[in-house]
Interface confidence: low
């Protein structure tokens, strides 16, 4: 064997978001014919020499980060990606509301507000059937999730959780579901918005609130699939990566510019008409990557 053995995968079934009192099984999956599996919990260090861990009744102490590896002969594999096992229902459920309304005309803005018993500084928003979550660390006891330029893809059922950054694996119960309905086209979709029309989050409007970037989120893994209680579709809790989103927007912008440059080769008259139309589109901010 040259080089380390490939890493196994570690999954929680049925979900890595586990309500207190419910059961969960962690399963480590490596290649066939493995000599030994090791499944370990980090902080505090505990391990089992088997390929699964059955937790019959989820407790606060079970929540945390897990990983696994396996041994073939004298060789150990690379460790799996870490799995975060979250205990939910530890705190009272937050409430989730949409402002100005849960029925939003396409092209308009909406803010989903997750409000919890005060002083939770982390909030997570999930959309049913989605593969990611939208996480916004914020001081105080509410979190705003602005969705700019709503599209049909934003329609759906949302739930949020709250938790304290000091106990990142102990979450609230899920909020009651909020159904976001995207209605027909906005009255003036081609209007160039002024700066005032962009939603501003509370933390940017009122600098007295503790800045949102004080909470480190570097340890959060990106590849875990989970299925919060009450929701059947698979979920994940990867962060929104704004930098990644911006990169995509830049690429889209560059593509549009290349297309515009290609138009120069065309007849002057048609180019002029086309350019006018496209420049109006460019002046509108590009919508963020769809949440769905």
């Amino acid at each position: 064997q040259s080089g380390p053995l490939p890493k196994p995968s570690l999954q929680a079934q049925p979900s890595s978001l586990v309500p207190l009192g419910q059961s969960v099984i962690l399963r480590c999956q490596g290649p066939p014919d493995v000599d030994l599996y090791r499944l370990e919990k980090l902080k505090p260090e505990k391990y089992e020499d088997q390929d699964f861990l059955f937790i019959p009744t989820m407790e606060r102490s079970n929540a945390g980060r897990y990983r696994c590896s396996y041994q073939n002969g004298s060789h150990w594999s690379l460790p799996s990606d870490q799995l975060e096992l979250i205990a939910t229902g530890v705190y009272a459920k937050p409430s989730l509301s949409a402002h100005p309304s849960s029925a939003v005309p396409q092209g308009r803005d909406v803010t989903l507000k997750c409000q919890s018993p005060y002083s939770f500084d982390e909030f997570v928003l999930y959309k049913e059937g989605d593969t990611g979550s939208y996480k916004r660390p914020e001081k105080w006891y509410r979190a705003n999730f602005p969705i700019i330029t709503v599209t049909a893809a934003h329609s759906g059922t949302y739930r949020c959780y709250s938790f304290s950054s000091s106990s990142p694996y102990l979450w609230s119960a899920p909020s009651d579901p909020l159904v976001l309905v995207v209605t027909g086209l906005s009255a003036t979709p081609s209007q160039v918005p002024t700066e005032e029309s962009f939603p501003v989050t509370e933390s940017s409007r009122r600098p007295s609130i503790l800045p949102t970037n004080k909470i480190s989120t570097t340890e959060k893994p990106m590849n875990i699939t989970a299925s919060p209680e009450g929701l059947s579709p698979p979920f994940g809790f990867a962060h929104q990566h704004y930098a990644k989103g911006n990169l995509v927007r830049i690429c889209l912008g560059a593509t549009i510019i290349i297309i515009l440059l290609g138009l120069l080769a065309e007849d002057w008259h048609s180019r002029k008409k086309c350019l006018q139309h496209r420049m109006r589109a460019l002046q509108r901010p590009l919508p963020p990557l769809p949440l769905a």
């Epitope: 009272a92 459920k93 002083s119 939770f120 001081k139 105080w140």
Partner: antibody
Framework: QVQLVQSGAEVKKPGASVKVSCKAS????????MHWVRQAPGQGLEWMGL????????EYAQRFQGRVTMTRDTSTSTVYMELSSLRSEDTAVYYC??????????????WGQGTLVTVSS | QSVLTQPPSVSAAPGQKVTISCSGS????????VSWYQQLPGTAPKLLIY???KRPSGIPDRFSGSKSGTSATLGITGLQTEDEADYYC???????????FGGGTKLTVLG
């Protein structure tokens, strides 16, 4: 020991404002939310709002919104509650109360002695 | 009109047991933590029970709290004359973003 000491009784005319102070001692002032609760004569307790002392962030009960202002001075470990446009029904004992937890709302573990505000023409 | 509902008064003889009920809804008691306060005549309220059933240090174990669904109960055993006071329940209401209190229950110790 941990205590909250409030300013003395006030008599105000309708339409005026009153500012009540609450000085905290015996604990780290910025580590607990502070609430204001009032009690009209012979009546029950009514929550007015809270202030987060380290940032000065506030949350007011909707019925006091626009009339109440809560501030704090970290250098003197004092919180203030100002109520404007006073009416006779604002006659009450006003209490400051410390939140027992920072993580979730468990209760008010320390109370000031109360400040009687009388609104009368 | 208080958001949480308590009986206006209860009474019992010294040494007896008494319970005070507090009824709310899913947005307060049902999904949050109940606390209980004792207010002796002419004094500020004092925390008796927090987090549904926990006693702060210094509160005798004669006082107990419980919660079921959207209702909570304060129990006092071995009643003493000094227990004569007003008792209030409270909880955070996440729908209205405020603390809500019961109307208070006057406990009379007979005899």
């Amino acid at each position: 020991q941990v205590q909250l000491v409030q300013s003395g009784a006030e008599v105000k005319k309708p339409g005026a404002s009153v500012k009540v102070s609450c000085k905290a001692s015996g604990y780290t002032f910025t580590s607990h939310y502070m609430h204001w609760v009032r009690q009209a004569p012979g009546q029950g307790l009514e929550w007015m709002g809270l202030i987060e002392p380290s940032e000065g962030e506030t949350e007011y009960a909707q019925r006091f919104q626009g009339r109440v202002t809560m501030t704090r001075d970290t250098s003197t470990s004092t919180v203030y509650m100002e109520l404007s446009s006073l009416r006779s029904e604002d006659t009450a004992v006003y209490y400051c109360a410390r939140d027992s937890s920072r993580s979730y709302p468990l209760g008010f573990d320390i109370w000031g002695q109360g400040t009687l505000v009388t609104v009368s023409s | 009109q208080s958001v949480l509902t308590q009986p206006p008064s209860v009474s019992a003889a010294p040494g007896q047991k008494v319970t005070i009920s507090c009824s709310g809804s899913s947005s307060n008691i049902g999904n949050n933590y109940v606390s209980w306060y004792q207010q002796l005549p002419g004094t500020a309220p004092k925390l008796l029970i927090y987090d549904n059933n926990k006693r702060p240090s210094g509160i005798p174990d004669r006082f107990s709290g419980s919660k079921s669904g959207t209702s909570a109960t304060l129990g006092i055993t071995g009643l003493q004359t000094e227990d004569e006071a007003d008792y209030y329940c409270a909880a955070w209401d996440f729908r209205s973003s405020r603390w809500v209190f019961g109307g208070g229950t006057k406990l009379t110790v007979l005899g």
